[in-house]
């Protein structure tokens, strides 16, 4: 995702077919406050962004709404009147999509089953990870809906849950972004925990002299 | 199995419009996701993307050529179309059909058609 | 437009040589690159998506990797069909774009 142009470093982000964000690390141009120019139609003039990202006092990125209709971006990073990078890209490739929203568990003997709203737009993946103090990694599984079961598990253990929403490879390519993850969201015997005990991480072999 | 087969006339005269047809067999052109392009090779040189139309109609056209790139389909026939204006002999290629991998998202192609020489000279 | 530069132009080998080929992006493309080989007379065919991702139905010898800019096409034993044109092209950038070529001979 990373763009390079004269010393320039891109980063582009399309979260949840809203929002564009386009960031860049001049380290040709230190103290300087470049310009962002984008457009979503080849046929457009420009527009100079509103929302620009500072950092140390100088623009760094440039926050722009998009709608779902709109797939190819058209932008220029300027330093005063001079582009030093000009570029088009398929915003699609750099989805980020939103964290799981009105999360909720429901258990039933050894197995829970967890569920979200749906995101608006297809070719998602959503991913819950489960583990429990006794597992060093957090164990994975996945739907195309956000309804997924996790079974086998054990009623007594107390066990940690977070959950993220992917873009599908098959639909958006290999470069997007899964969302953030969900709150971590702790459960023991159908009911919730304010935590579960750190996993137990396994003894070092004592070396024998 | 999907098949894509241009025809049309291979000896266009300067000025004129270059008029081409692919006949995709085996797939329809209105599956959902899907994207059809024009692509054509130069002699001797590589290949050059021209354009697509989507299962929703939808077009993009090279930037260096839209200005005289037209692509539209007959669903009915199961055909999309390409016409290109006030051709030069610049224009003068082998013209291939292509259907993009991944629908909705124009990736690579993963079909092509046999490709059709067209001449440009009077 | 994303200039895509290959290398070499041409390259003459024998059967059962691993044969490599690169390909360069004038701006980073992420993983978005895929190849084609293209024998006379033919359609062109895909070999590899998304850089290192196989067809179903391509030999095994065909692999590719890399990311960003630098992207390699590997043939790891020549064979008889494999004598033909390869191109290399991005897609995230807008338009799509291909490499000039490279025209693998028998040596």
């Known amino acids: 995702q990373v763009a390079t142009g004269e010393g320039l470093q891109i980063q582009i982000m399309y979260f949840n077919l809203e929002t564009v964000q386009v960031t860049w690390n001049a380290s040709h141009y230190p103290r300087s406050n470049l310009s962002f120019h984008y457009k979503f139609s080849r046929d457009e003039a420009y527009d100079q962004c509103t929302v620009y990202i500072l950092q140390e006092g100088h623009t760094s990125g440039c926050l722009l709404d998009a709608e779902q209709q709109d797939d190819i971006l058209y932008f220029s990073i300027r330093n005063g009147t001079h582009p030093v990078f000009t570029a088009s890209r398929w915003i699609f490739y750099y989805l980020k999509p939103s964290s799981p929203k009105q999360v909720s568990f429901s258990w039933h003997q050894d197995a829970v089953t967890l569920t979200c709203s749906d995101l608006s737009y297809r070719g998602l993946l959503y991913e819950v990870q489960y583990r429990s103090p006794f597992d060093t990694e957090w164990q994975s599984k996945q739907e195309n809906t956000c309804n997924v079961t996790v079974e086998d598990l054990d009623a007594e253990k107390c066990y940690a849950f977070r959950a993220r929403v992917k873009a599908m490879e098959d639909a958006y390519g290999p470069d997007t972004y899964p969302s953030d993850w969900s709150e971590v969201t702790c459960w023991q015997r159908g009911e919730t925990r304010d935590s579960c005990p750190e996993p137990r991480t396994p003894p070092k072999p004592k070396l024998s002299k | 199995q999907v098949q894509l087969q241009e025809s049309g006339p291979g000896l266009v005269k300067p000025s004129q419009t270059l008029s081409l047809t692919c006949t995709v067999s085996?797939?329809?052109?209105?599956?959902?996701?899907?994207?059809w392009s024009w692509i054509r090779q130069h002699p001797g040189k590589g290949l050059e993307w021209i354009g697509y139309?989507?299962?929703?109609?939808?077009?993009y056209y090279s930037p260096s050529l839209k200005s005289r790139v037209t692509i539209s389909r007959d669903t009915s026939k199961n055909q999309f179309s390409l016409k290109l204006s006030s051709v030069t002999a610049a224009d003068t290629a082998v013209y291939y059909c292509?259907?993009?991998?991944?629908?909705?998202?124009?990736?690579?192609?993963?079909?092509w058609g046999q490709g059709t020489l067209v001449t440009v000279s009077s | 437009d994303i200039q895509m530069t290959q290398s070499p132009s041409s390259l003459s080998a024998s059967v059962g040589d691993r044969v490599t080929i690169t390909c360069r992006a004038s701006?980073?493309?992420?993983?978005?690159l895929h190849w084609y080989q293209h024998r006379p007379g033919e359609t062109p065919k895909l070999l590899i998506k998304?850089?290192?991702r196989s067809i179903s139905g391509v030999p095994s010898r065909f692999s590719g990797s890399g990311s960003g800019t630098d992207f390699t096409l590997t043939i790891s034993s020549l064979q008889p069909e494999d004598f033909a044109t390869y191109y290399c092209?991005?897609?995230?950038?807008?338009?799509?774009?291909f490499g000039q070529g490279t025209k693998l001979e028998i040596k």
């Open positions: 292509a259907r993009s991998l991944y629908g909705g998202y124009k990736d690579a192609f993963d079909s």
């Open positions: 085996g797939f329809s052109i209105t599956t959902s996701g899907y994207y």
């Open positions: 139309i989507g299962y929703n109609s939808k077009t």
């Open positions: 701006q980073s493309i992420g993983t978005s």
């Open positions: 998304f850089a290192s």
């Open positions: 092209q991005q897609s995230p950038g807008f338009p799509p774009t």
